[in-house]
């Protein structure tokens, strides 16, 4: 469930603190409820960037697990089509810490509406 997703995000946050990853990531910091799935897709795609840049097994595994969890949760809700949402590349670029904080916020949005 989404609680496990948050715990994976916290784990990623802890793991990257011990590394120097200065990437900036497309971050949706003000998610509109009607675009939350699109925003989630962008967060997950950017997580893969963190995984790739870190070259770390623990981060890789945790990112992969998080994507598997999110996929399964969202697929159980059926196909959700959203329109008029920002493309990932249109989002503001932020550092990893801010990116992960915003990611936690969107997950909490899913928790609150489930």
């Amino acid at each position: 469930n989404w609680v496990n997703v948050i715990s994976d995000l916290k784990k990623i946050e802890d793991l990257i603190q011990s590394m120097h990853i200065d990437a900036t990531l497309y971050t949706e910091s003000d998610v509109h409820p009607s675009c939350k799935v699109t925003a989630m897709k962008c967060f997950l795609l950017e997580l893969q960037v963190i995984s790739h840049e870190s070259g770390d097994t623990d981060i890789h595994d945790t990112v992969e697990n998080l994507i598997i969890l999110a996929n399964n949760i969202l697929s159980s809700n059926g196909n959700i089509t959203e329109s008029g949402c920002k493309e990932c590349e249109e989002l503001e670029e932020k550092n990893i810490k801010e990116f992960l904080q915003s990611f936690v916020h969107i997950v909490q949005m899913f928790i609150n509406t489930s």
Epitope: S51, D61, E64
Partner: antibody, heavy 122, light 112 residues
Framework: EVRLMASGGGLVQPGGSLRLSCAAS????????MSWVRQAPGKGLEWVAT????????YYPDSVKGRFTISRDNSKNTLYLQMNSLRAEDTAVYYC???????????????WGQGTLVTVSS | DVVMTQSPLSLPVTLGQPASISCRSS???????????LEWYQQRPGQSPRLLIY???NRFSGVPDRFSGSGSGTDFTLKISRVEAEDVGVYYC?????????FGQGTKLEIK
Amino acid sequence: EVRLMASGGGLVQPGGSLRLSCAASEFTFSNYAMSWVRQAPGKGLEWVATISRGGDYTYYPDSVKGRFTISRDNSKNTLYLQMNSLRAEDTAVYYCARRVSMITGGWAMDYWGQGTLVTVSS
Amino acid sequence: DVVMTQSPLSLPVTLGQPASISCRSSQSIVDITGNTYLEWYQQRPGQSPRLLIYKVFNRFSGVPDRFSGSGSGTDFTLKISRVEAEDVGVYYCFQESFVPYTFGQGTKLEIK
């Protein structure tokens, strides 16, 4: 050439336990997730379990969840499948397979071992 | 769970002729990141399965170019442009987009 050698199969009574092993060589074992897939006699393939590269994350179908445990020892380049509370329907050839992970270009089981036969019968 | 349904289950083909196997999923297997983890495996008689195609249309290394994969959403196809004797066996589609990962029932290709 990537090599995967499954072993540990045999005859076991219903309710019994068995541990399968899969010895990996000719590749960096810790860089790959791994899976077990089984095939009942004359039947199709069924995914049984997957484990992440570091071993922290495991995935199972409901048919084996709570009875089977996938694990790995990266220092020994070995994958395991602990099977408890075995049933007649668990009778199958069990294959281990290397799993290419998504972040390196897509999920797929790119190399398979030769399989080991597990027979559950009284 | 995603159910994968293959057709036909048996496919007699003349050597040198094309062959086509269909695989349909019970729901879209496009994941949240836009990827479709649909694979095709070949199992020759008495052998372990072998990866042919991954992510719908990507041929695995060493797989002859007479094998091709296509499709999207819920409908997928494996095509063999000209069947050779070594192609005899059972072909399985497999989705790895959602847990539990699931195989199709298999299609047995035989020479007429």
